[in-house]
Interface confidence: low
């Protein structure tokens, strides 16, 4: 979290911010909160992005102001309007480019002053994986699969019965590229796989850290996926 | 004082090649967008494409009508911004003028001209 | 990709006289800059984001619209406004600056 002060004459205004991070070719939102004005006309919300020359992105006189916004913008972003009054600045960013990653800054100003915060935003690809019973395979064997990452990541194996195990020796990972040429498909075999356990097969790089449970019994197959963002810093 | 100042134009077969340049001065030339605009005798003014700025990784988009044909190049080093014309046709025929997009998204500095003739 | 038409053409007016300009963009646009260019000079930038006037451009010319329509009006036309107009946009998809056709203002 990131909390920014106003300086210069006016009175000073906070401005919050959260680092996050953007799924590429997904939507993304930059969040950044401040405090509110009775008027809407009042409030000018620029975010721009450091190494940019245009502006990301400006709202004033309670609408969008795109004369100066940077071409690689346009045409991509958005502020929720109807929550300006309540000191919402979160940006909307369509289409997430891997040149997207950078630092931000949150610039408002109101009639109580001015405020501005900074924010680092990561870009890259992550996706849930799906652990199945691969049976087509000779022996017991768990493949897991996720379609979008970027960069690389790493996969490592674990199992409830077996804490602490090492499976890297009965396990094998590919990546393959996606047809865009940047995110890759997560191919990751285990081999030896015991019944009436719970395996779990973690994908993490430096934006997020997946995991895919499968519990595999006799009788029954259960799955279970959960994706986590990292480094979500509010400033 | 910004200046912008084409050159390379002139009278050249159809089917020719030529290859006009513009010399900047005044700016940070790596800063900017720069484009080429031409306009035929007494008809209106036609885009032919951009060469982004150095944040924008120098890229280029053409307008359909000279893709393949016409190809723009900048040296940062120089200053300079280049369209290298190949398979020239006679309604190439125009004035080309460089131009600088001002970050507002509209051209704020235009060099004076130069003609290009397509003649047999 | 977005089309900028221009009316009208030509016109004919007498000293003093109001002139508008119209530019119709074929979708929606945020934005409208206009050139003025006289004969056998360069085009020059007249209004830019659709109201802002050009370093040393007239008070008399003013800029407005959104959305498709945008307009250039003259107040109190002078001989000096003899010139073509043009009006420009940017468009993002695909990524290109688009002029419409001109619009001739001529001294009656």
């Known amino acids: 979290l990131i909390i920014g002060f106003g300086i210069s004459g006016r009175h000073s205004i906070t401005v919050t911010t959260v680092a996050s991070a953007g799924n590429i070719g997904e939507d993304g939102i930059l969040s950044c909160t401040f405090e509110p004005d009775i008027k809407l006309s009042d409030i000018v919300i620029q975010w721009l992005k450091e190494g940019v020359l245009g502006l990301v992105h400006e709202f004033k006189e309670g609408k969008d102001e795109l004369s100066e916004q940077d071409e690689m913008f346009r045409g991509r972003t958005a502020v929720f309007a109807d929550q300006v009054i309540v000191g919402n600045a979160s940006l909307r960013l369509k289409n997430v480019q891997l040149t997207d990653a950078g630092t931000y800054k949150c610039y408002i100003i109101t009639s109580k002053g001015k405020g501005n915060a900074n924010l680092e935003y990561k870009t890259g690809a992550f996706s849930m994986p799906e652990v199945n019973v691969d049976y087509n395979a000779s022996s017991e064997t768990l493949r897991c699969e996720a379609p979008r990452w970027f960069p690389q990541p790493t996969v490592v194996w674990a199992s409830q019965v077996d804490q602490g195990a090492n499976f890297s020796e009965v396990s094998n990972t590919s990546f393959e590229l996606n047809s865009e040429n940047v995110t890759m498909k997560v191919v990751s075999v285990l081999y030896n796989v015991t019944i009436n356990n719970t395996y779990s097969c973690m994908i993490e790089n430096d934006i997020a850290k997946a995991t895919g449970d499968i519990k595999v019994t006799e009788s029954e197959i259960k799955r279970r996926s959960h994706l986590q963002l990292l480094n979500s810093k509010a400033s | 004082e910004v200046q912008l100042v084409e050159s390379g134009g002139g009278l050249v077969q159809p089917g020719g090649s030529l290859r006009l340049s513009c010399a900047t001065s005044g700016f940070t030339f790596s800063d900017y967008y720069m484009s080429w605009v031409r306009q035929a005798p007494g008809k209106g003014l036609e885009l032919l494409g951009f060469?982004?700025?150095?944040?924008?990784?120098?890229?280029?988009e053409y307008s359909a009508s000279v893709k393949g044909r016409f190809t723009m190049s900048r040296d940062n080093s120089k200053n300079s911004l280049y369209l290298q014309m190949n398979s020239l046709k006679t309604e190439d025929t125009a004035v080309y003028y460089c131009?600088?997009?001002?970050?507002?998204?509209?051209?704020?500095?235009w060099g004076q001209g130069t003609t290009v003739t397509v003649s047999s | 990709e977005i089309v900028l038409t221009q009316s009208p053409d030509f016109q004919s007016v007498t000293p003093k006289e109001k002139v508008t300009i119209t530019c119709r963009a074929s979708s929606s646009v945020s934005s409208m800059h206009w050139y003025q260019q006289k004969p056998d000079q360069s085009p020059k930038p007249w209004i830019y984001a659709t109201s802002n006037l050009a370093s040393g451009v007239p008070s008399r010319f003013s800029g407005s619209g959104s959305g498709t329509d945008y307009t250039l009006t003259i107040n109190s036309l002078e001989a000096e406004d003899a010139a073509t107009y043009y009006c420009q946009q940017w468009s993002s998809n695909p990524p290109m600056y688009t002029f419409g056709g001109g619009t001739k203002v001529e001294i009656k």
């Open positions: 131009a600088r997009d001002s970050h507002r998204t509209y051209f704020d500095y």
């Open positions: 060469i982004r700025n150095k944040a924008n990784g120098y890229t280029r």
